[in-house]
Interface confidence: medium
């Protein structure tokens, strides 16, 4: 089946620094979502993109509009509360109903 490759699997940042998470898709995707997992294990939706970029505070997400084969999540001025696990998920263009998840990025922000 279609696959989502998320990188890096783990990331340590110092408070106040910037970084980016990336997801590569083995086929063209119709849309992409970025989530953050809360302490109870529930997923909080950060972004939903069908193309282009979206920004929310210190977070910015982009989805390659041409090839539709990758997406990035940029974190600016990382704060301690940004620590957690981030997931991307993509919806296949085939319309077969499947949302396919990346394996997650464990982000640790250090003081």
């Amino acid at each position: 089946g279609d696959q989502v490759e998320q990188s890096p699997s783990a990331l340590s940042l110092h408070e106040g620094t910037d970084s980016a998470l990336r997801c590569n898709f083995t086929t063209t995707m119709r849309s992409v979502q970025w989530f953050r997992q809360n302490s109870r294990g529930s997923l909080i939706s950060l972004f939903y993109l069908a193309s282009g970029t979206k920004e929310n505070g210190r977070l910015k997400s982009a989805f390659d509009s041409k090839e539709r084969r990758y997406s990035t999540l940029h974190i600016r001025d990382a704060q301690l509360e940004d620590s957690g696990t981030y997931f991307c998920a993509a919806e296949a263009s085939s319309g077969s109903w499947q949302l396919i998840f990346g394996s997650g990025t464990q982000l640790t922000v250090m003081p």
């Epitope: 069908a50 919806e91 949302l99």
Partner: antibody
Framework: QVQLQESGAGLVKPGASVKLSCTAS????????MHWVKQRPEQGLEWIGR????????KYDPKFQGKATITADTSSNTAYLQLSSLTSEDTAVYYC??????WGQGTTVTVSS | DIELTQSPAIMSASPGEKVTITCSAS?????MYWYQQKSDASPKLWIY???NLAPGVPARFSGSGSGNSYSLTISSMEGEDAATYYC?????????FGGGTKLEIK
């Protein structure tokens, strides 16, 4: 947050039609596919079909062809399921879903005279 | 249509017990998806692509299988696992579901 809210059900008479709506928030339905699933009381799940709201293309399980009609209105960000010639077999909870992650809470149709 | 048969239809397990639910396909499928549904709630994606746990699903769950035979396993049953589990195939339209397995806690 992505949310799907179904409405439009209730008690309907045999032979009548009903139109269920599924209003989306947190995303544009034209960027995805919208699906409908049926669940009869104490029974399993049945995929009815889906629509590509960007162009109106639909795909159905053949057993729901003629019974179900899926449409969408991108201006109101809403997908619809119309069920015709209702019988007791159509008594069920109907769910709309985006991909297989985001599901509505379900809406109940009860067919009874 | 590809028919999916789940077994058992109903089962109960004690806390700590290992649980296996099987899903048998009438034709070979490429992979299987699993959902958990609790009473009066919408189904939740639980396992995708046969063996990948959806985010937030406890590690005691696992999925395996190929061809015509797939399974969902709980290594050590917990009270919160009591629910109905459905398998679903995406190999051939229409996307069919299994009849469900109702798992109860003893």
């Amino acid at each position: 947050q992505v949310q799907l809210q179904e409405s439009g059900a209730g008690l309907v008479k045999p032979g009548a039609s009903v139109k269920l709506s599924c209003t989306a928030s947190g995303f544009n339905i034209k960027d995805t596919y919208m699906h409908w699933v049926k669940q009869r009381p104490e029974q399993g799940l049945e995929w009815i079909g889906r629509i590509d709201p960007a162009n109106g293309n639909t795909k159905y399980d053949p057993k729901f062809q003629g019974k179900a009609t899926i449409t969408a209105d991108t201006s109101s960000n809403t997908a619809y399921l119309q069920l015709s010639s209702l019988t007791s077999e159509d008594t069920a909870v109907y769910y709309c879903a985006r991909a297989n992650w985001d599901w509505g809470q379900g809406t109940t149709v009860t067919v009874s005279s | 249509d590809i028919e999916l048969t789940q077994s058992p239809a109903i089962m109960s397990a004690s806390p700590g017990e290992k649980v296996t639910i099987t899903c048998s396909a009438s034709s070979s499928v490429n992979y299987m998806y699993w959902y958990q549904q609790k009473s009066d709630a919408s189904p939740k994606l639980w396992i995708y692509y046969t063996s990948n746990l959806a985010p937030g699903v406890p590690a005691r769950f696992s999925g395996s299988g190929s061809g015509n035979s797939y399974s969902l396993t709980i290594s050590s049953m917990e009270g919160e696992d009591a629910a109905t589990y459905y398998c679903q195939q995406f190999t051939s339209s229409p996307w069919t579901f299994g009849g469900g397995t109702k798992l109860e806690i003893k």
